[in-house]
Interface confidence: low
């Protein structure tokens, strides 16, 4: 807390400008009107305040807006956002994607902080669903964002948003999350032709059921081993040797290297040895 002291004569701030960087903390508190600060937040843009001075500016805004800052102020917070606590952010009503982007930029290159997580939560709840533009923005800043959501939260992602998802966005997703995302992806990409469809659906296949894998095996897709190894074990087990051969195409030889790992190991144990021998890979059931 900064003590309440009278502003020295002639030091009352008439606008937010660079002269303020020479003010001591108590002078900022006494001489800068909070309403002026709020209306000229964008002017703070290029002023090299110290972090201690930023604390004073935050304190002034907190006093002016005890119920939470308006979006016109939030959009121009910049580095002041790094001073906010999750409790502060929970009071906000952020509806503009531009505001969200401006604040995410400030934290860019860092792990998702509790402040950012709270901000995103407030924003998404305010919108009611993870629409495409929001998802596009969030995954651009945090590629792992999608996989940090619970299956319940993912259920609010509309299929149209799936177009914004890149393969790397799904790297850390577990099977339960892919179970939710896969049907949405199938719906999103349903009008694409075979080869294009497979390119798009490939990263979601960890949520695919057996019937879909069987259908893919009829389309000369040449699935790579990395994708095959991420498939659900229960979806792979019912596939025949012929179906797996068709599904993998030239990559079928990779099964030998993966024979001790799931789902290949479990699948091998389910097959007749005669069928496995047709692959000529020396796989032992």
């Amino acid at each position: 807390e900064v003590e309440k002291t009278a502003c020295p004569s002639g030091k009352k701030a008439r606008e937010i400008d660079e002269s303020l960087i020479f003010y001591k903390k108590w002078e900022l508190e006494a001489c800068v009107d909070a309403a002026l600060l709020a209306t000229q937040m964008d002017r703070v843009n290029a002023i090299p305040f110290t972090y201690e001075q930023l604390d004073v500016l935050k304190h002034k805004l907190d006093e002016l807006y005890p119920q939470g800052y308006p979006e016109s102020v939030i959009q121009h917070l910049g580095y002041l956002f790094l001073k906010m606590s999750p409790e502060d952010i929970r009071k906000w009503n952020v509806t503009s994607l531009e505001t969200l982007k401006a604040l995410l930029e400030v934290n860019k290159g860092h792990e998702m902080s509790p402040q950012v997580a709270t901000l995103i939560d407030r924003f998404v709840k305010g919108r009611g669903q993870l629409d495409k533009d929001t998802l596009d923005t969030l995954t651009a800043f945090y590629p792992g964002y999608l996989c940090s959501l619970s299956p319940e939260e993912l259920s609010s992602v509309p299929p149209s948003s799936i177009w914004a998802v890149r393969p790397q966005d799904l790297d850390t997703c577990d099977p339960r999350q892919l179970d939710v995302l896969y049907p949405k992806a199938r719906l999103a990409f349903q009008n694409m032709n075979g080869s294009e469809y497979f390119v798009k659906i490939q990263s979601f296949l960890g949520g695919a059921p057996t019937e879909d894998l069987k259908a893919l095996s009829q389309q000369n897709v040449s699935m790579d081993l990395a994708t095959f190894m991420k498939l659900r074990t229960d979806a792979v087990l019912p596939l025949t040797v012929a179906e797996v051969q068709k599904l993998l195409g030239p990559h079928v030889e990779g099964l030998k290297a993966e024979e001790r790992h799931r789902p290949v190991r479990d699948w091998i144990l389910r097959q007749r040895q005669d069928d496995l021998d047709t692959l000529g890979l020396g796989l032992q059931g």
């Epitope: 305040f49 956002f81 290159g109």
Partner: nanobody
Framework: QVRLVESGGGSVQAGGSLRLSCAAS????????MGWFRQAPGKEREAVAG????????YYADSVKDRFTISQDNAKNTVYLQMNSLKPEDTAMYYC???????????????????WGQGTQVTVSS
């Protein structure tokens, strides 16, 4: 991806001048602050001067005020550092840096720098 390429370093006598250039390529959208840090052998990397590229507002470390001038050429996406009255203590590797400045162009710490150049050596002899 942003790439920063410095040039203009070299050796000079005390009291002399040098002009460093930093050309940025790639999507600079959002990285509003560009400028220079330096690192002398065995010392921490420190901010020298920065500029808010849209507005031309500047930041200088106390040690270089009134001697160094930072400027920009928006058309060329290039930032310049004019160094006059050079002193032996200005000897260091000078690095161009780009960092995001949404509200505060606080160029004084390297923590929030997103991109660095490879560096250009400046040597000032007495």
């Amino acid at each position: 991806q942003v790439r920063l390429v410095e040039s203009g370093g070299g050796s000079v006598q005390a009291g002399g001048s040098l002009r460093l250039s930093c050309a940025a390529s790639g999507d600079m959208n959002g990285y509003k602050c560009m400028g220079w840090f330096r690192q002398a052998p065995g010392k921490e990397r420190e901010a020298v001067a920065g500029i808010y590229t849209g507005r031309g507002t500047t930041y200088y470390a106390d040690s270089v005020k009134d001697r160094f001038t930072i400027s920009q050429d928006n058309a060329k996406n290039t930032v310049y550092l004019q160094m006059n009255s050079l002193k032996p203590e200005d000897t260091a590797m000078y690095y161009c840096a780009a960092k995001y400045c949404a509200v505060v162009a606080e160029f004084g710490g390297p923590r929030l720098v997103r991109y660095w150049g490879q560096g250009t050596q400046v040597t000032v002899s007495s």
